[in-house]
């Protein structure tokens, strides 16, 4: 790499992947190894993250730009550029401070992340339960009560107060 | 460049609660992990916790109980709240940027002591 | 925690000749592609720490080419090839590979 010209500041010229070596008289040298510089002009070069632990690489460093990492199996992301690994748990619950734990009656979870939610009132919307919920799916609203036959029920019970759910650190 | 530098009280009473920020120039809080890093005097570093700009933390488990981490992206600061602090908690405090979460400490403040005395 | 030992505790050396310090892991700090997580710092007086070697052995941008840093596994070693005055304080050594991250005691060089 030569070096820079640049009257006003001469580190104004490194181009990205390389850096400003204050040792080389403020030439411009390659950025180490595990390292990046994703703009010009840069006086050092940012060492790239490590995917490690639950983390894995989703996408190599390079010498302009830093690695991404995402989650081993049985884990998801959490947070912006994935900062945290959650762990999965089943469809049917949720994870607490003890682990995963079974939706109570009355809600449900879809996912394999998440917190169990209340079974939708079917009744506050005017409609009856055409089928029930269950741990893993929301209950199925269906036409309203007087559109059925007499006796038919519609109540479904309050949700029961929870444990929020956790990420484990 | 980044610089980081770390403002509160130099003196906190015992069993009181520790503040301090450290505000971030020179380029943007997102996309790093910042730490906390303590030294007492003449003795060695110890890493306090870490924060994720989205707000994710991961603390010291010798002082998760004490310890809260907080971000605010919009002034791009992060801060450091100790509780039920004792003269063993008097030392140097550093914030640093981390590179990984927990490891490579490639931009440091220049430190602020904290003595804990009534 | 992973427990960092280094040695010696103290080290005192005459300018321009060459300095060695030792870091001990309680585990293998090395991960995957060969990475190891292991870091070098110096503090020198009245100054924060300074990152000179991560990944074991790879020099942070901008640190003069007289340092360099060895090592696998749970043995790790930082040489100074020629030590200069400015090369003064306590060298510490890092674990990065598992939370909470933990240094080492530390390593004081001084000038003889």
């Known amino acids: 790499f030569e070096r820079t010209r640049s009257l006003q500041d001469p580190c104004s010229n490194c181009p990205a992947g390389t850096f400003c070596d204050n040792n080389r008289n403020q030439i411009c040298s390659p950025c180490p190894p595990n390292s990046f510089s994703s703009a010009g002009g840069q006086r050092t070069c940012d060492i790239c993250r490590q995917c490690k632990g639950v983390f894995r690489t989703r996408k190599e460093c390079s010498s302009t730009s830093n690695a991404e990492c995402d989650c081993t199996p049985g884990f998801h992301c959490l947070g912006a550029g994935c900062s945290m690994c959650e762990q999965d748990c089943k469809q049917g619950q949720e994870l607490t401070k003890k682990g995963c734990k079974d939706c109570c009656f009355g809600t449900f979870n879809d996912q394999k992340r998440g917190i169990c939610r209340p079974w939708t009132n079917c009744s506050l919307d005017g409609k009856s339960v055409l089928v029930n919920g269950t741990k893993e799916r929301d209950v199925v609203c269906g036409p309203s009560p007087a559109d059925l036959s007499p006796g038919a029920s519609s109540v479904t019970p309050p949700a029961p107060a929870r444990e929020p759910g956790h990420s484990p650190q | 460049q980044v610089q980081l530098q770390e403002s509160g009280p130099g003196l906190v009473k015992p069993s009181e609660t520790l503040s301090l920020t450290c505000t971030v120039s020179?380029?943007?809080?997102?996309?790093?992990?910042w730490s906390w890093i303590r030294q007492p005097p003449g003795k060695g570093l110890e890493w306090m916790g870490y924060i994720y700009y989205s707000g994710s933390t991961n603390i010291n488990p010798s002082l998760k109980s004490r310890v809260t981490i907080s971000v605010d992206t919009s002034k791009n600061q992060f801060s450091l709240k100790l509780s039920s602090v004792t003269a063993a908690d008097t030392a140097v405090y550093y914030c640093?940027?981390?590179?990984?979460?927990?490891?490579?400490?490639?931009?440091w403040g220049q430190g602020t002591l904290v003595t804990v005395s009534s | 925690e992973i427990v960092m030992t280094q040695s010696p505790l103290s080290l005192p050396v005459t300018p321009g000749e060459p300095a060695s310090i030792s870091c001990r892991s309680s585990q293998s700090l090395l991960y995957s592609q060969g990475y190891n997580h292991l870091d070098w710092y110096l503090q020198k007086p009245g100054q924060s720490p300074q990152l000179l070697i991560y990944g074991g052995s790879n020099r942070a941008s901008g640190v003069p080419d007289r340092f360099s840093g060895s090592g696998s596994g749970t043995d790790f070693t930082l040489k100074i090839s020629r030590v200069e005055a400015e090369d003064v304080g306590v060298y510490y050594c890092m674990q990065a590979l598992q939370t909470p991250p933990t240094f080492g005691q530390g390593t004081k060089l001084e000038i003889k």
């Open positions: 020179g380029g943007s809080i997102s996309s790093y992990y």
């Open positions: 640093a940027r981390d590179q990984s979460g927990g490891g490579s400490f490639q931009h």
